[in-house]
């Protein structure tokens, strides 16, 4: 399955929209920094098969949806902004969902890279939790603001390399 | 609201197979993963697997693999779960049971569905 | 597989007492995804605490969870009528996802 160039485009805006959507200076943010544990390998496209990395990608779009789809995220951002980023969410999904249908149909019994679709999961618990214990805070959004957009750009780099497979 | 509404109690002859309906509302369908657990009469839960309704793919529990299967109808908002070669240690009541992340990981349950598998 | 072990298997205590239920893991569980359950009979379970020590919505605060590693505990301070239930911990730290065996808290 070839993922369209409108794909990379639609996370490349994606990205852009993220950044806009910052309403604090991250300076102020400093004593609210966390390490999230991005999990990089997990979006090292030479490690597994083209298939499994779709659905790789796939749970890190569809998690970063749900994140941002919470009423708490709403109260927290410039709704037309969230919506247009919400959007550009969305149409990645059916995209990724399109191939990964098409892959499980071709296989005899469909592989799952159990592992890495868990610590892409885990990933996002952890960003859940940092939210809940900051109580939701201007300053907790913008940090996760920061790492959501971090985990993009390892998802566009991963993109690349799988364009490059075909 | 959330919602997770299960098919009826079955009865089945060992050998046979039986398929379990879990129709969800109240939230969108295809963004949360959905698991099984099942529990014999008197026993604890056991986790069998789980679905993502977005695209088909499933990971199932080691001791169901290749006994188990997981399908989902993105159009009714359903998932099924049919389990094979049904044996009397299948009779359990069989729960489907919502993904998700922090506070929402099986916070949301079916009803549960008994199933009793006798000669 | 991470065995959950809980202990004990049956704990009888009088309303008003406090109640303490163990959950011991088999190799080491991230806290984050470590949870309790309740459940009565005839019913499904029940989310109680999330992440280890977190409440879920609606639990009523004489309930809480500590622990880390293996070792997990699920404290009730002040038992009411209506707790006395089988209390399950469960992890997802890893496949495949397993839950203890249930600790039945029953009255004296």
């Known amino acids: 399955c070839d993922l369209p160039q409108t794909h990379s485009l639609g996370n490349r805006r994606a990205l852009i929209l993220l950044a806009q959507m910052g309403r604090i200076s991250p300076f102020s943010c400093l004593k609210d920094r966390h390490d999230f544990g991005l999990p990089q390998e997990e979006f090292d496209g030479n490690q597994f098969q083209k298939t499994q990395a779709i659905s790789v990608l796939h749970e890190m779009i569809q998690q970063t949806f749900n994140l941002f789809s919470t009423e708490d995220s709403s109260a927290a951002w410039e709704q037309s902004l969230l919506e247009k980023f919400s959007t550009e969410l969305y149409q990645q999904l059916n995209n990724l969902e399109a191939c990964v249908i098409q892959e499980v149909g071709m296989e005899e019994t469909p592989l799952m890279n159990e592992d890495s679709i868990l610590a892409v999961r885990k990933y996002f618990q952890r960003i859940t939790l940092y939210l809940t214990e900051k109580k939701y805070s201007p300053c907790a959004w913008e940090v996760v603001r920061a790492e959501i957009m971090r985990s993009l750009s390892f998802s566009t780099n991963l993109q690349k390399i799988l364009r490059r497979k075909d | 609201q959330v919602q997770l509404v299960q098919s009826g109690a079955e009865v089945k002859k060992p050998g046979a197979s039986v398929k379990v309906s879990c129709k969800a509302s109240?939230?969108?369908?295809?963004?949360?993963?959905m698991h099984w657990v099942r529990q014999a009469p008197g026993q604890g839960l056991e986790w069998m697997g789980e679905?993502?309704?977005?695209?088909?793919?499933?990971i199932y529990a080691q001791k169901f693999q290749g006994r188990v299967t997981m399908t989902r109808d993105t159009s009714t908002s359903t998932v099924y779960m049919e389990l094979s070669s049904l044996r009397s240690e299948d009779t359990a009541v069989y729960y489907c049971a919502r993904g998700g992340l922090g506070p929402a990981w099986f916070a949301y349950w079916g009803q549960g569905t008994l199933v009793t598998v006798s000669s | 597989e991470i065995v959950l072990t809980q202990s004990p298997a049956t704990l009888s205590l009088s309303p008003g007492e406090r109640a303490t239920l163990s959950c011991s893991a088999g190799?080491?569980?991230?806290?984050?995804?470590l949870y309790w359950y309740q459940q009565k009979p005839g019913q499904a379970p029940r989310l109680l605490i999330y992440s280890t020590s977190n409440l879920a919505s609606g639990i009523p605060a004489r309930f809480s969870g500590s622990g880390s590693g293996t070792d997990f505990t699920l404290t009730i301070s002040s038992l009411e009528p209506e707790d006395f239930a089988v209390y399950y911990c469960?992890?997802?730290?890893?496949?495949?996802?397993?839950f203890g065996q249930g600790t039945k808290l029953e009255i004296k």
């Open positions: 469960h992890q997802w730290s890893s496949y495949p996802f397993t």
């Open positions: 679905i993502n309704p977005s695209h088909g793919r499933t």
């Open positions: 109240g939230y969108t369908f295809r963004n949360y993963w």
């Open positions: 190799s080491s569980v991230d806290s984050s995804e």
